[in-house]
């Protein structure tokens, strides 16, 4: 058993049918010695008396808010949560496996630049009685500071019969140098509590590996005289690290017909302009990627040919 | 149609072209190592990230873009002195900091070159003959060093009398390649920045 926060405790259980569970001793936070009784949740049934209460915690019916009283007055509370270990592996019931970029990916994180700011998000089908708390650091043995905000519900979508809820959090490394070469990964830890179930999820990454630039901005077409060709131009996104000559991007320019089946023409360039043939009803899209370290491509910025 | 990227004109700043070749070569070598050594811990998640140049050179700090010198998190107190007569500096007025930067890059390359050559000698003794260092990568390191053209004491190749542990050598190779790729990215950024200045 360990303390998650004041008066909230997590009991770790080896989870299998007929398991013996864990013996837990609760102590009433009071100078009083006699006349103390204990109850669980809303029940008025007295579970025991005395300053300490010994219980055998086996399943969720044994978890909850234990309260000690004296003469009708509440003295203190202890909330017991359960953390299930199933055959040596902690349960992952609360969050959905996003399966991207690989199986067992519960947390996904992205950064728009090298400033040390990043966003993580996760999915669940649970809509109520759910709380999250996020901590982060650079490295784990001698951790350096990363400050995270509160996790918020960022999207809701319907998936088949189920509703899916997306939560996200923003974090910022306290003293980040955009040009630094990372040798210690960022660690992100999410505590999830659903009713009386506790779970924790972690992700470890280098900022360089989660970079996904914003799409190029100010995408414009300039027709070339007496030609079907157009000059496409764009700019670096505002959110990208500066100076751009140091933090350079490379670009992919795509000409896509109306039909998805039509052949796509693609050109790769380090410049912020390109000359392409603009077909009728086609659209031109441009996306960006770090020129020197191949992390994710940005989403496409698009403009119609006409 | 996948059209290749047009190579920028290297004339203005000869090291830019070499540094791009370096990044391409080390990235290819790392990819090859990860495929060949699939049963070894060779991914970014599995290896310890060590920097053999730590406390010996200070490339990131010495080559910091002017715009980032205001960022306190980027300023490290490490002081390292370097020789300052490189040919990449030819025909431009160069600040002491730029010379320091390029000589720091040269020292990095020299240290990695020695490590890689020592390691290759060991890998050539492996009866499995599983992996060797790409000669192209070693040649590209050499070319960039020549383009930088700093006068520097030659570092003798390390020789080892004891029987090599090939498993450890291959893991060390992965660690070295990951670190060198990160440094090659920095070098490429620096060359691009200097070229634009």
């Amino acid at each position: 058993i360990w303390e998650l926060k004041k008066d909230v405790y997590v009991v770790e259980l080896d989870w299998y049918p007929d398991a013996p569970g864990e013996m837990v001793v609760l102590t009433c936070d009071t100078p009083e010695e006699d006349g103390i009784t204990w109850t669980l949740d809303q029940s008025s049934e007295v579970l025991g008396s005395g300053k300490t209460l010994t219980i055998q915690v086996k399943e969720f019916g044994d978890a909850g808010q234990y309260t000690c009283h004296k003469g009708g007055e509440v003295l203190s509370h202890s909330l017991l949560l359960l953390h299930k270990k199933e055959d040596g592996i902690w349960s992952t019931d609360i969050l959905k496996d996003q399966k991207e970029p690989k199986n067992k990916t519960f947390l996904r994180c992205e950064a728009k630049n090298y400033s040390g700011r990043f966003t993580c998000w996760w999915l669940t089908t649970i809509s109520t009685d759910l709380t999250f708390s996020v901590k982060s650091s650079r490295g784990s043995s001698d951790p350096q500071g990363v400050t995270c905000g509160a996790a918020t519900l960022s999207a809701e979508r319907v998936r088949g019969d189920n509703k899916e809820y997306e939560y996200s959090v923003e974090c910022q490394e306290d003293s980040a140098c955009p040009a630094a070469e990372e040798s210690l990964p960022i660690e992100v830890m999410v505590d999830a509590v659903h009713k009386l179930k506790y779970e924790n999820y972690t992700s470890s990454f280098f900022i360089r590996d989660i970079i996904k630039p914003d799409p190029p901005k100010n995408l414009q077409l300039k027709p070339l005289k007496n030609s079907r060709q157009v000059e496409v131009s764009w700019e670096y996104p505002d959110t990208w690290s500066t100076p751009h000559s140091y933090f350079s991007l490379t670009f992919c320019v795509q000409v896509q017909g109306k039909s998805k089946r039509e052949k796509k023409d693609r050109v790769f360039t380090d410049k912020t302009s390109a000359t392409v043939i603009c077909r009728k009803n086609a659209s031109i899209s441009v996306r960006a990627q770090d020129r020197y370290y191949s992390s994710s491509w940005s989403e496409w910025a698009s403009v119609p040919c006409s | 149609r996948n059209l290749p990227v047009a190579t920028p004109d290297p004339g203005m700043f000869p090291c830019l072209h070499h540094s791009q070749n370096l990044l391409r070569a080390v990235s290819n070598m790392l990819q090859k190592a990860r495929q060949t050594l699939e049963f070894y811990p060779c991914t970014s998640e599995e290896i310890d990230h060590e920097d053999i140049t730590k406390d010996k050179t200070s490339t990131v700090e010495a080559c910091l873009p002017l715009e980032l010198t205001k960022n306190e998190s980027c300023l490290n107190s490490r002081e390292t002195s370097f020789i300052t007569n490189g040919s990449c500096l030819a025909s431009r007025k160069t600040s002491f900091m730029m010379a320091l930067c390029l000589s720091s890059i040269y020292e990095d390359l020299k240290m990695y070159q020695v490590e890689f050559k020592t390691m290759n000698a060991k890998l050539l003794m492996d009866p499995k003959r599983q992996i060797f260092l790409d000669q192209n990568m070693l040649a590209v390191i050499d070319e960039l060093m020549q383009a930088l053209n700093f006068n520097s004491e030659t570092v003798p190749q390390k020789s080892s009398l004891e029987e090599p542990d090939f498993y450890k050598t291959k893991i060390k190779l992965c660690i070295l390649l990951h670190a060198f790729r990160i440094r090659a990215v920095t070098i490429d950024r620096v060359m691009s920045y200097l070229n634009a200045s």
Partner: antibody, heavy 115, light 112 residues
Framework: QVQLVQSGGGVVQPGRSLRLSCAAS????????MHWVRQAPGKGLEWVAF????????YYADSVKGRFTISRDNSKNTLYLQMKSLRAEDTAVYYC????????WGQGTMVTVSS | SYVLTQPPSVSGTPGQRVTISCSGG????????VKWYQQLPGTAPKLLIY???QRPSGVPDRFSGSKSGTSASLAITGVQAEDEADYYC????????????FGTGTKVTVLG
């Protein structure tokens, strides 16, 4: 004590269907994940499928994906394996088992796919 | 396809020490725990070892398990005639959990 009693095995022709059942008692069935494991005659153990305690997630071996469906009825304390498009290579003894560090196995039920 | 490899058979005379190996990889045995089962002919498998080296109550102490890196082993010290059976190791793969990964199985023969 924990008990898992299996039923539903038998002889079936290729291409036909069969449903296996596993009745649980002696524990809170709705709190635990469950597996199906099979063993072809003279061969080793092969995992077939898993279902979460609440039925929300199901996982299958590649060899049965799209043909077999694992399900559970927590109100009846019963686990099921619906097998469709059966093949000769599905011939095996099928076991249900609880998920956890200490597990309990059913007695096994023989499924023979033969024309 | 079995990714946990066991020797097809091992044998020993009564009282001898018999060991069975179970060889895996960095994504299965490496980060996960290992179980061992005993299966007598015509019966369901019986759990002998869980959590690499833990014995459930009722399992004789002549059975012991261990794990090192990406391999595990089961030892029977002082093998007895009733130990003649098939033995299977079981673990998980990091990417496919909760799918069970079973070893190829080892037939233990007690001679004499």
């Amino acid at each position: 004590q924990v008990q898992l009693v299996q039923s539903g095995g038998g002889v079936v022709q290729p291409g036909r269907s069969l449903r296996l059942s596993c009745a649980a008692s002696g524990f809170t069935f709705s709190s635990y994940g469950m597996h199906w494991v099979r063993q072809a005659p003279g061969k080793g153990l092969e995992w077939v499928a898993f279902i979460r305690y609440d039925g929300s997630n199901k996982y299958y071996a590649d060899s049965v994906k799209g043909r077999f469906t694992i399900s559970r009825d927590n109100s009846k304390n019963t686990l099921y394996l619906q097998m469709k498009s059966l093949r000769a290579e599905d011939t095996a003894v099928y076991y249900c088992k609880t998920h956890g560090s200490h597990d309990n196995w059913g007695q096994g039920t023989m499924v023979t796919v033969s024309s | 396809s079995y990714v946990l490899t066991q020797p097809p058979s091992v044998s020993g005379t009564p009282g001898q020490r018999v060991t069975i190996s179970c060889s895996g990889g960095r994504s299965n045995i490496g980060p996960n725990t290992v179980k061992w089962y005993q299966q007598l002919p015509g019966t369901a498998p019986k759990l002998l070892i869980y959590g690499n080296d833990q014995r459930p109550s009722g399992v004789p102490d002549r059975f012991s398990g261990s794990k090192s890196g990406t391999s595990a082993s089961l030892a029977i010290t002082g093998v007895q005639a009733e130990d003649e059976a098939d033995y299977y190791c079981q673990s998980y793969d990091r990417g496919t959990h909760p799918a069970l990964l079973f070893g190829t199985g080892t037939k233990v023969t007690v001679l004499g």
